[in-house]
């Protein structure tokens, strides 16, 4: 089976690598534009330089083409937390992250939130924060992990998970009491 | 006692209209970003818009983009999600929820209204 190519693709795939065929002129191989420019206009004839032009600002191309336009600068997302790592320039879009103590979460591929890293309170580090995902916590005894977080087993329910984890402390307790009956 | 009220949910046929709206009370609605989830049969959650408090900043998934409007009234304390050119890849529960805060789970939900695009 011969995979299934764009129009773009089928185009481009005719010229060598960096050129890419006129759009009016199938027998035409233009230059592609250098990141940070775009297409103005096609390259008039064979060996004829293309018009790439600059992108204005506010708009970056991060790899050579023959876009029309370029792209729209991203921004940093207030509410989510989000922070200016570095700004934007003509050849490479804005770059978003985190605070210091801080992980990102992603709802979704190109939606992230940043969140306080756990300090694992009544437990001790297992795993440290990383730049994608929080710290990983191993309770102390008598405590169980709920949300990443050390919670005291007596706030455990018996429809819980945490019963298993917090049942030998509970068996500790009554025999610890049985034994100072006799 | 925090509450969020779904509503607006229907059968549309492909290329048609709804509007959702989402009642809040028992927190500072004008406080606090909006987010509007929603749930496919037999997949997991999907995030589809969200909201800024004053109702400025926006975002919405890919699959939405051009499609779907987001916006808040904060004298009213409700959300709403204008969904046109409805397809069938639309049909889910919808939620309305308070952007989370603490961490990535969400503390609230509403009980969600279905949308079904099928002709």
């Known amino acids: 089976l011969v995979p299934h190519l764009g129009d773009r693709e089928k185009r481009d795939s005719v010229c060598p690598q960096g050129k890419y065929i006129h759009p009016q002129n199938n027998s035409i191989c233009c230059t592609k534009c250098h990141k940070g420019t775009y297409l103005y206009n096609d390259c008039p004839g064979p060996g004829q330089d293309t018009d790439c032009r600059e992108c204005e600002s506010g708009s970056f191309t991060a790899s050579e083409n023959h876009l029309r336009h370029c792209l729209s600068c991203s921004k940093c997302r207030k509410e989510m937390g989000q922070v200016e790592i570095s700004s934007c320039t003509v050849d490479r879009d804005t770059v978003c992250g985190c605070r210091k103590n801080q992980y990102r979460h992603y709802w979704s591929e190109n939606l992230f939130q940043c969140f306080n890293c756990s300090l694992c309170l009544n437990g001790t580090v297992h795993l440290s924060c990383q730049e994608k995902q929080n710290t990983v916590c191993t309770c102390h005894a008598g405590f169980f992990l709920r949300e990443n977080e050390c919670v005291s087993c007596s706030n455990c329910k018996k429809s819980l998970e945490c019963t298993k984890l917090c049942l030998p402390q509970i068996e500790n307790v009554k025999g610890t009491e049985d034994s100072g009956t006799t | 006692e925090v509450q969020l009220l779904e509503s607006g949910g229907g059968l549309v046929q492909p290329g048609g209209s709804l509007r959702l709206s989402c009642a809040a009370s028992g927190f500072t609605f004008a406080h606090e970003p909006m987010v509007w989830v929603r749930q496919a049969p037999g997949k997991g959650l999907g995030w589809v818009s969200h909201?800024?408090?004053?109702?400025?900043?926006?975002y919405y998934a890919d699959s939405v983009k051009g499609r779907f409007t987001i916006s808040r009234d904060n004298s009213k304390n409700t959300l709403y999600l204008q969904m046109n050119s409805l397809r069938a890849e639309d049909t889910a529960v919808y939620y309305c929820a308070p952007l989370p805060k603490r961490g990535p789970r969400f503390d609230y939900w509403g009980q969600g209204t279905l949308v079904t695009v099928s002709s």
């Open positions: 909201i800024d408090r004053v109702g400025q900043d926006t």
